[in-house]
């Protein structure tokens, strides 16, 4: 049986598949900051995970996925506050015992080093130096993320 | 009309604790953070911290962190400040202050400030 | 925690003149810096966001500019409405913090 911060994320996710496709992001939109091939948007106030979950989507957008160790680092040094945590898009699913992204996909445990338990309503939160496991009620700020698309040049056929 | 409405003067004693209120009207209570300032000598503005009125999650300048407790009562949408042991260094006007977007750090709607005077 | 220095405790100008007050970031602030005004026994109102998007309904003889450190709010042509103090705000960290103000008094 699915927690219901798992069905939140499920729900997003199959709601983000349905959409009709957008055109490519080829810029990040004013307020957000560039990443490499994503766009990032740092929140000003605190909410539970599944509040940050839903406040992302509300931009058109999903709390941030880490791809690996360095795309991390590079996260880690645009945070400026030592002391704040930032909720991202990876939560424990009671069901398949393991960290699960909000696009579906599981942790490669090597991608990072978190610190606490996990267990059934714990969620990761990234500080400027670690990541942590915290309850997902505690009220923290969060990432949001667009993907930028690559500019692929388009042939066109003869009219 | 976007409004947030703060409670009245207070001139308490030394050592005393006290309570300003600030009651939104015109627009989602929930939807917006609050959040609360200081003035001093009719100038110096201080951040004191926020409130997210959703949820109750409050983040607070450290300096402020033993000073100032915030919360908010949904039903009335009414939030508060309380604010400890007070001295004659806390004597200021104290502002409720809106947070404008969830993503940046502007304040777009302001109460009109409550005077305080911590004074024997 | 960040200091936001502006310079000019009191500016004098008159009405129609062009006005700069600056503002200075200790350090980097991008350009998350918002501008208030404050006109007498008023709270403070935002005038510009984002270091130079006016906000909605603020006459467009405000207007603000820099990134990094040195920020300056212009007003085109001073009106005598004008008269308030003008404060800096930056939030490029969570502790946000403001500028000392600056008095614009009409000659």
């Known amino acids: 049986q699915k927690s219901s911060i798992e069905k939140c994320s499920v729900d997003i996710q199959q709601s983000r598949n349905k959409t009709t496709e957008r055109p490519g992001l080829l810029n990040c939109p004013i307020y957000w900051q560039q990443l490499r091939e994503k766009c990032l948007l740092f929140s000003h106030t605190v909410n539970p995970w599944n509040n940050s979950l839903a406040d992302c989507s509300t931009k058109e957008s999903s709390l941030l996925l880490i791809r690996d160790k360095d795309e991390l680092i590079h996260t880690q040094n645009l945070i400026r506050d030592k002391a704040i945590l930032f909720w991202i898009g990876l939560n424990f699913s009671l069901s398949e015992k393991n960290w699960k992204w909000i696009n579906g996909s599981f942790l490669n445990s090597n991608d990072l080093e978190i610190r606490g338990d996990a267990k059934e309503n714990s969620c990761i939160s990234i500080s400027q130096t670690s990541v942590y496991s915290e309850y997902c009620s505690t009220e923290i700020r969060w990432i949001c993320q667009k993907e930028l698309t690559p500019v692929r040049n388009k042939v066109y056929p003869d009219s | 009309e976007v409004q947030l409405q703060q409670s009245g003067p207070e001139l308490v004693k030394p050592g005393a604790s006290m309570k300003i209120s600030c009651k939104a009207s015109?627009?989602?209570?929930?939807?917006?953070?609050m959040n609360w300032v200081k003035q001093s000598h009719g100038k110096n503005l201080e951040w004191i911290g926020l409130i997210n009125p959703n949820t109750g999650g409050t983040y607070y300048n450290q300096k402020f962190k033993d000073k100032a407790t915030l919360t908010v009562d949904k039903s009335s949408s009414t939030a508060y400040m309380e604010l400890l042991s007070l001295t004659s260094e806390d004597s200021a006007v104290y502002y409720c202050?809106?947070?404008?977007?969830?993503?940046?750090?502007?304040?777009?709607?302001w109460g009109q400030g409550t005077t305080l005077t911590v004074s024997s | 925690d960040i200091v936001m220095t502006q310079s000019h405790k009191f500016m004098s100008t008159s009405v129609g003149d062009r006005v700069n007050i600056t503002c200075k970031a200790s350090q980097d602030v991008g350009t998350a810096v918002v501008w208030y005004q404050q006109t007498p026994g008023q709270s403070p109102k935002v005038l510009i966001d984002w270091a130079s998007i006016r906000h909605t309904g603020v006459p467009d003889r405000f207007t603000g500019s820099g990134s990094g450190t040195d920020f300056t709010l212009t007003i085109s042509s001073v009106q005598s409405e004008d008269l308030a103090d003008y404060f800096c705000q930056q939030y490029s960290t969570y502790l946000y913090t403001f500028g000392g103000g600056t008095k614009l008094e009409i000659k």
């Open positions: 015109g627009y989602s209570f929930t939807g917006y953070t």
């Open positions: 202050a809106r947070l404008g977007d969830n993503y940046r750090g502007y304040f777009d709607v």
